[in-house]
Interface confidence: medium
């Protein structure tokens, strides 16, 4: 099995984790995709997923998590807004491909959320107030109930993540594999 690596992000409460998961375009464009958290000793837990089949550039919101699948570019954008300390954990993106095991994307992301903003109070909110407005047409999707542990047989692509500060609500905890996007405050 290939050893999974983690990439660590250190963010403040109230900021946004904005990550992108790259996938093989032709193979997975319309596949259902999910954002998962992995806690020590537990199976991966799915926090949010796209519709089935996944729709192009159509935001799906589950609490404080927003997923957007960009088929033309082969990437899933994941945002966790208004981060809380309890959101700290290990995350990952996966592609559902029943009846096979979910296909994991990229290196895992270790998210560390600490209390309080750095710098001037409120500066992050101000600087990103116009950044992560959640579209009014977001959809909630039903996710498959199963999450099974998997043996990684190939090195996953690398990931990308981003940070910002919007105002929305999400319920999360730990997660495993994801890709990161840059952070804008």
């Amino acid at each position: 099995a290939t050893k999974l690596t983690e990439e660590k992000y250190e963010l403040k409460e109230g900021q946004t984790l904005d990550v992108k998961c790259d996938y093989t375009l032709e193979k997975f464009a319309s596949s259902q995709k999910a954002w998962q958290i992995i806690r020590d000793g537990e199976m991966p837990k799915t926090l949010a997923c796209t519709e089935r089949p996944s729709k192009n550039s159509h935001p799906v919101q589950v609490g404080r998590i927003i997923l957007e699948d960009y088929h033309d570019h082969g990437l899933l954008r994941v945002r966790m807004v208004n981060l809380q300390v309890e959101d700290s954990g290990l995350y990952q993106c996966v592609i559902y491909q029943p009846p096979k095991e979910p296909h994991m994307l990229f290196d895992r992301i270790r998210l560390v959320v600490t209390k309080g903003f750095s710098g001037t109070p409120g500066s992050n909110e101000n600087s990103t107030q116009n950044v992560y407005k959640i579209p009014p047409t977001t959809t909630k999707a039903l996710c498959p109930l199963y999450t099974s542990p998997r043996t990684v047989t190939q090195a996953p692509p690398k990931s990308t993540a981003d940070v910002s500060t919007p105002d929305s609500e999400i319920n999360l905890t730990n997660v495993t594999d994801i890709i990161r996007v840059p952070v804008f405050n």
């Epitope: 992000y9 992108k20 954008r77 290196d107 950044v131 990308t160 993540a161 981003d162 990161r180 840059p182």
Partner: antibody
């Protein structure tokens, strides 16, 4: 080989606006961060803001939040930075720079790896 | 915002010298730090990314280390073309912030 080509030098009056363009040739444009960085005479580098063209949502440094607008046009592979209410202190060289995108662990995993040649903006009455 | 503090702000050295520049972040940034070289009239050049990875085409005399809040750029044996201003930049979170720069001059 990705290249970023910026528009030419500008001379502006205080209170006016300037719009600098940054055209990408070669490689992928849409899913990279295009950042804008400036350097005033005798000063250091200052990150103004950036945009991922595909997502279209700009991010700004706090000190420029009220005066700068960063946009991108995917069809022409061009990013723009418009700075309003110009002051003499805005006299600087303005650079666009690309942060890495797909297949990396972070949109800017490689830092700002490709830079434009710079655009000199002079604000003077 | 995350503040980046470089030291020293200026440094005089001779060809062949080993030079170290440090950069400190006001909060943890994991390894999301880059180093740039900037010469007058030219665009900045990326040297190091992810704190310690050498950008393609950059001579191996440049190296970076550190994680969390403390980072170092080392030039093992100064060459004439290395005299320039060096900047660190964090990209753990927006706004991406630069250090104030370290000007490396010929002694």
């Amino acid at each position: 080989q990705v290249q970023l080509v910026q528009s030419g030098a500008e001379v502006k009056r205080p209170g006016s606006s300037v719009k600098v363009s940054c055209k990408a040739s070669g490689g992928t444009f849409s899913i990279y961060v295009i950042s804008w960085v400036r350097q005033a005479p005798g000063q250091g580098l200052e990150w103004m803001g950036g945009i991922i063209p595909l997502f279209g949502t700009p991010n700004y440094a706090q000190q420029f939040q009220d005066r700068v607008t960063i946009t991108a046009d995917e069809s022409t592979r061009t990013a723009y930075m418009e700075l309003n209410s110009l002051k003499s202190e805005d006299t600087a060289v303005y650079y666009c720079a690309r942060g890495h995108g797909p297949g990396s662990s972070h949109y800017s995993y490689y830092g700002l790896d490709v830079w434009g040649q710079g655009t000199t903006v002079t604000v003077s009455s | 915002d995350i503040q980046m503090t470089q030291s020293p702000t200026s440094l005089s050295a001779s060809v062949g010298d080993r030079v170290t520049i440090t950069c400190r972040a006001s909060q943890g940034i994991s390894s999301w730090l880059a180093w740039y070289q900037h010469k007058p009239g030219k665009a900045p050049k990326s040297l190091i990314y992810a704190a310690s990875s050498l950008q393609s085409g950059v001579p191996s005399r440049f190296s970076g280390s550190g994680s969390g809040t403390d980072f170092t750029l080392t030039i093992s044996s100064l060459q004439p073309e290395d005299f320039a201003t060096y900047y660190c930049q964090q990209y753990n979170s927006y706004p991406y912030t630069f250090g104030q720069g370290t000007k490396l001059e010929i002694k």
